[in-house]
Interface confidence: medium
């Protein structure tokens, strides 16, 4: 049997067609191509909805940067 068979990997087959406002985004995770059909970013919104997005699009990259900065602990 394949390794990690009891831990199925979530995949993206299609990407959202519309840009999502960063104010609606809570977090993200990357999906790698070795386990799924496409490399993808899965955004989780503030209402816990998950949406697949294209990591090559600038708005997706900008949104990830924004979320990264949000999660960094503030320097005192």
């Amino acid at each position: 049997q394949p390794d990690a068979i009891n831990a199925p990997v979530t995949c993206c087959y299609n990407f959202t067609n519309r840009k999502i406002s960063v104010q609606r985004l809570a977090s993200y995770r990357r999906i790698t191509s070795s386990k799924c059909p496409k490399e993808a970013v899965i955004f989780k919104t503030i209402v816990a909805k998950e949406i697949c997005a294209d990591p090559k699009q600038k708005w997706v990259q900008d949104s990830m940067d924004h979320l990264d900065k949000q999660t960094q602990t503030p320097k005192t």
């Epitope: 199925p8 990997v9 979530t10 995949c11 993206c12 087959y13 299609n14 990407f15 959202t16 067609n17 999906i31 059909p37 993808a40 899965i42 909805k49 998950e50 949406i51 697949c52 997005a53």
Partner: nanobody, 125 residues
Framework: EVQLVESGGGLVQAGGSLRLSCAAS????????MGWFRQAPGKEREFVAA????????YYADSVKGRFTISRDNAKNTVYLLMNSLNPEDTAVYYC??????????????????WGQGTQVTVSS
């Protein structure tokens, strides 16, 4: 519960072809993607190809594009993987898997959580 049974593996010379079949049973597959993965000894499982059961959209790993073709026969609940121009690097156990898709096309799937037992493909040089 979903059952997946692969067949069609075997030994083939480099440059040859094989067609793998995956017969699915146990429930309705209208909202599934059916995928083929492979695992060579000592290596990680690797995505090969997938097809959406509902609309027939296909997806391929870069390493097999132009050589492998995935297709489906809805009437037989069977998915096929036609493998042409095989080379020794394609040697692996090939697994069929089912991935439950979300209603929203842009939502992530649940993940490949149903698997067949695998069929061995050996390509000799």
């Amino acid at each position: 519960e979903v059952q997946l049974v692969e067949s069609g593996g075997g030994l083939v010379q480099a440059g040859g072809s094989l067609r793998l079949s995956c017969a699915a049973s146990g429930r309705t597959f209208s909202n599934y993607a059916m995928g083929w993965f492979r695992q060579a000894p000592g290596k990680e499982r690797e995505f090969v190809a997938a097809i959406s059961w509902s609309d027939g959209s296909t997806y391929y790993a870069d390493s097999v594009k132009g050589r492998f073709t995935i297709s489906r026969d809805n009437a037989k609940n069977t998915v096929y993987l036609l493998m042409n121009s095989l080379n020794p690097e394609d040697t692996a156990v090939y697994y069929c898997a089912a991935d439950l898709l979300a209603e929203d096309p842009a939502a992530p799937s649940r993940g490949y959580d149903y698997w067949g037992q695998g069929t061995q493909v050996t390509v000799s040089s």
